[in-house]
Amino acid sequence: QDPYVKEAENLKKYFNAGHSDVADNGTLFLGILKNWKEESDRKIMQSQIVSFYFKLFKNFKDDQSIQKSVETIKEDMNVKFFNSNKKKRDDFEKLTNYSVTDLNVQRKAIHELIQVMAELSPAAKTGKRKRSQMLFRGRRASQ
Amino acid sequence: QDPYVKEAENLKKYFNAGHSDVADNGTLFLGILKNWKEESDRKIMQSQIVSFYFKLFKNFKDDQSIQKSVETIKEDMNVKFFNSNKKKRDDFEKLTNYSVTDLNVQRKAIHELIQVMAELSPAAKTGKRKRSQMLFRGRRASQ
């Protein structure tokens, strides 16, 4: 059994979240995750879900009684979602920490908008990546 | 030329974001996007970037002089990032709007944590999807 399970059960007790009434009015995340099977769609949704949990845990950072549980779960999220890749986790954290009301950040975001938009669709790859895809398709077709 | 380009240039003027000083202290998003080539990694990062822009645009929703530009850009983001899929966009918005300080939301999030965690790694697919992958691998191997 993964280490997070026991710690999540501990958090359930702490938040009184095992009661049947918690399930009233539908789910937050599970229903949405059911809607998306394609890996890249799932990553779009899971990215928001993971950042929600990180914010939630930050909110409770002063509650000593659940610190061990929170740290264990965060570590397990790191393994599962970021493949234990520190750089990936750090870049993600950077993005979640930008303040939408900081004028310097606002101006930088607008400055970068055209280039960000150009990269948004999966088709918008560098020439190199496009070429490697075509080669791959060619090999597949010739098998 | 995509419609967003002209409108993004308009926003640059409005935010005084064309100045060379805006680029001081590095980029917000572009440097991070350069780090990740794998499509699912890019989606993790782009998900945070798109939600940042949506929050930024919401912050400026009462500035009539840029409303047309903002709407055009949001629409283009919808096309590029969500493939014009309303359901995908709605699910995404739902996730970004959950309040981390709402007690009901906190309890639901903790209630769903174990199942969310179980689905985080790409390997964690339903039995059905695992089976179809194995069949596919089998076919590939026999080609």
């Epitope: 606002q106 | 409005y14 912050n59 009462d62 500035d63």
Partner: nanobody
Framework: QVQLQDSGGGTVQAGGSLRLSCAAS????????VGWFRQAPGKEREFVAR????????SYANSVDGRFTVSTDNAKNTVYLQMNSLKPEDTAIYYC????????????????WGQGTQVTVSS
């Protein structure tokens, strides 16, 4: 003639709070953004925060983001700067300003200034 009347300054301990007010008169301001700037002794005047008169659309200097909140009361033609978790380095004269463009951090491009209100944060 546009007039900006700022008030609410004072002396406070580090960690304390103050609320500055700026009452505007002389025209309809709904399409404008109003800003707060500050000037510490021996330093240039610097941008602190801005907001559209109609509410929303807030921007802050990095040094105050998360501690200061700017808001407006349209009915009273007044803009407020709520300053929390004050630090000694926040000590300055604070000026209410009506900028010449909607987003400006450049004090040379401001049309109208309030007379300024002194904020002193002691450690």
């Amino acid at each position: 003639q546009v007039q900006l009347q700022d008030s609410g300054g004072g002396t406070v301990q580090a960690g304390g709070s103050l609320r500055l007010s700026c009452a505007a008169s002389g025209r309809t301001f709904s399409n404008y953004a109003v800003g707060w700037f500050r000037q510490a002794p021996g330093k240039e005047r610097e941008f602190v925060a801005r907001i559209k008169w109609s509410g929303g659309s807030r921007s802050y200097a990095n040094s105050v983001d998360g501690r200061f909140t700017v808001s407006t009361d349209n009915a009273k033609n007044t803009v407020y700067l709520q300053m929390n978790s004050l630090k000694p380095e926040d000590t300055a004269i604070y000026y209410c300003a009506l900028p010449s463009n909607i987003i400006t951090t450049d004090y040379l491009r401001v049309y109208y200034w309030g007379q300024g209100t002194q904020v002193t944060v002691s450690s």
